[in-house]
Interface confidence: low
């Protein structure tokens, strides 16, 4: 089948890193500098992504794969394939259109990215506040008075932080 296909379409024999050059009798030519083809049988090579400005190169472009960028310190990636760099804020802040702003009372952010989230409402679980919340930390819920019996656990650990690298888009 491969041989049949290649007789019909000579370009199908061109491997990744090359392109099928119509100007040269459909022979497989290497991708020019700063371009790549990640699959075989391509009729053109793609221009490599360039990591400039706030972007920095995480992986150099090769003839078979695009460059990959990340962000300079003080910024973090957003979007598919780090298509944008967003400014970091301090813990206890969130990024708004006017820059980094402190979390409002009753909310917190324990990361350098993402939004301020409301403190846990301990009373919804019938618990009391053991440790007050801050701009940087959620409240710690403790047992309700009825739970304070010998052998009962004294502290419920706070909810785990959001997985690194994920924040509301």
């Amino acid at each position: 089948f491969e041989r049949t296909r290649s007789l019909q379409d000579p370009c199908s024999n061109c491997p990744a890193g090359t392109f099928c050059d119509n100007n040269r009798n459909q022979i497989c030519s290497p991708c020019p500098p700063n371009s790549f083809s990640s699959a075989g049988g391509q009729r053109t090579c793609d221009i490599c992504r360039q990591c400039k400005g706030v972007f920095r190169t995480r992986k150099e472009c090769s003839s078979t794969s695009n460059a990959e960028c990340d962000c300079t310190p003080g910024f973090h990636c957003l979007g598919a394939g780090c298509s944008m760099c967003e400014q970091d804020c301090k813990q206890g802040q969130e990024l708004t259109k006017k820059g980094c702003k402190d979390c409002c009372f009753g909310t917190f952010n324990d990361q350098k990215r993402g939004i301020c989230r409301p403190w846990t409402n301990c009373s919804l679980d019938g618990k009391s506040v053991l440790v007050n919340g801050t701009k940087e930390r959620d409240v710690v819920c403790g047992p309700s008075p009825a739970d304070l019996s010998p052998g009962a656990s004294s502290v419920t650990p706070p909810a785990p932080a959001r997985e690194p690298g994920h924040s509301p888009q």
Epitope: A39, Q42, T44
Partner: nanobody, 122 residues
């Protein structure tokens, strides 16, 4: 001079489909990555999708993945966005944008079209 002209917008019911087109002129279309970007009423710009110069590398925003398909025809200097299973939240002005050649594969744009309005409503 560089020109990008979108067409194909209109009113469509939820669940319906539309195909947007963008006619490019004034530059070597086949050398540039191209994007679709949208702006919902009263909201900021949202990147939707982009396609590499040859069309072999494509990416989508999570909000449209599986519903929208970007494509290009370099012989016709045209970019397309096929939009299926449309939702009310897809209502926006859709812009075709040329990606800045210094920042290929990013959401950095140097030229924009005038936009075409897509309204999804029953």
């Amino acid at each position: 001079q560089v020109q990008l002209v979108e067409s194909g917008g209109g009113l469509v019911q939820p669940g319906g489909s539309l195909r947007l087109s963008c006619a490019a002129s004034g530059f070597t279309f086949s050398s540039y990555w191209m994007s679709w970007v949208r702006q919902a009423p009263g909201k900021g710009l949202e990147w939707v999708s982009h396609i590499s110069s040859s069309g072999s590398t494509i990416d989508y925003a999570e909000s449209v993945k599986g519903r929208f398909t970007i494509s290009r025809d370099n012989a016709k200097n045209s970019l397309y966005l096929q939009m299926n299973s449309l939702r009310a939240e897809d209502t926006a002005v859709y812009y075709c944008a040329r990606e800045d050649p210094r920042m290929t594969g990013t959401t950095d744009f140097d030229y924009w079209g005038q936009g075409t309005l897509v309204t999804v409503s029953s």
